[in-house]
Interface confidence: medium
């Protein structure tokens, strides 16, 4: 015998109290598959969460995070504060870049300052947690029209610094 509930489409539930009639999901609930005996309560995006997609009778609401926060976990189950410049995201949250490294973005990792001496140049402006060093001219750069700023070195792994 076929289960009469199997005829109930998504957006409805099989109402045992009404002779297994397919009843529409009540407000603020949904069923995403057919043959359901109950409808699930819609997710509510509150506080630091904001609604990315409204709940419908056939699909749950989807949340994302308010500005200054980003999603973590499956289906944006958590919101975590964005890191600031001069910080990087670790498993223990946002942590300041250590001396000799910088991050000029709100995402990503702290990277080592450019080593000016590798290019035979001197440090014109010291680095900070938020900014790379600016390399000054080497003797060869003092000819007219030469640029005095070296572009940052390519991104590489900062290496395992803690001892």
């Amino acid at each position: 015998l076929q289960d009469p509930c199997s005829n109930c489409p998504a957006g409805t539930f099989c109402d045992n109290n009404r002779n297994q009639i397919c009843s529409p999901c009540p407000p603020n609930s949904f069923s995403s598959a057919g043959g359901q005996r109950t409808c699930d309560i819609c997710r509510q995006c509150k506080g630091v969460f904001r609604t990315r997609k409204e709940c419908s009778s056939t699909s749950n609401a989807e949340c994302d995070c308010t500005p200054g926060f980003h999603c973590l976990g499956a289906g944006c189950s958590m919101c975590e504060q964005d890191c600031k410049q001069g910080q990087e995201l670790t498993k223990k949250g946002c942590k300041d870049c250590c001396f000799g490294t910088f991050n000029d973005q709100k995402r990503g990792i702290c990277r080592p300052w450019t080593n000016c001496s590798l290019d035979g140049k001197s440090v014109l402006v010291n680095g900070t947690k938020e900014r790379d060093v600016v390399c000054g001219p080497s003797p060869a750069d003092l000819s007219p029209g030469a640029s005095s700023v070296t572009p940052p070195a390519p991104a590489r792994e900062p290496g395992h610094s803690p001892q």
């Epitope: 980003h70 990087e88 670790t90």
Partner: antibody
Framework: EVQLVESGGGLVQPGGSLRLSCAAS?????????MCWVRQAPGKGLEWIGC????????YYASWAKGRFTISRDNSKNTVYLQMNSLRAEDTAVYYC?????????????????WGQGTLVTVSS | IQMTQSPSSLSASVGDRVTITCQSS????????LAWYQQKPGKAPKLLIY???NLASGVPSRFSGSGSGTDFTLTISSLQPEDFATYYC????????????FGTGTKVTVL
Amino acid sequence: EVQLVESGGGLVQPGGSLRLSCAASGFSFNNDYDMCWVRQAPGKGLEWIGCIDTGDGSTYYASWAKGRFTISRDNSKNTVYLQMNSLRAEDTAVYYCAREAASSSGYGMGYFDLWGQGTLVTVSS
Amino acid sequence: IQMTQSPSSLSASVGDRVTITCQSSQSVYDNNWLAWYQQKPGKAPKLLIYRASNLASGVPSRFSGSGSGTDFTLTISSLQPEDFATYYCQGTYLSSNWYWAFGTGTKVTVL
């Protein structure tokens, strides 16, 4: 030299127990990143077992490993352990110790930048 | 959490461009906590790429990574003889607790 050396592998009967060790040299544990265990059955892929936070001792396990496998550490010896109980034939594998890379500030970054050479565990009667 | 790599194996020639994909059943932490490793027979894995697109120290620039969330790609721009190996992706996740997972692996062999 920075390295990890596993030991303690060998032949064990089904239902038996074994404790593997992972000795670290060239760096010290007292930081907030993890030391982890990963295994690889013969001819198969890598399988994460679990990790221990070298700072606060928190442990994290794969769902299949909970209950039978226990990770511990001795920071004074710079050594991490994997205690394996109720061993089965399907636990036969090379067991690797791996260090989670740390950020510039010394916190875990989620990927493994240093691996041991592995130790073979064979579960057979 | 399932991490599926495709293809599971491929044959290629030196100089070929090789692309391996990794699909996760859940978004990795911060959408980019994904790493790639190379493993040769009888050896431990070696880190190639971290945070989805950052080249690890000492890794040749012919290796590159891209992707975000659940879908990631490892590309070898011009395959070299030493690149014949098995490649694994690895994701880091946070739900109620920290969790790591490896992909199913892709074996790259000589055509």
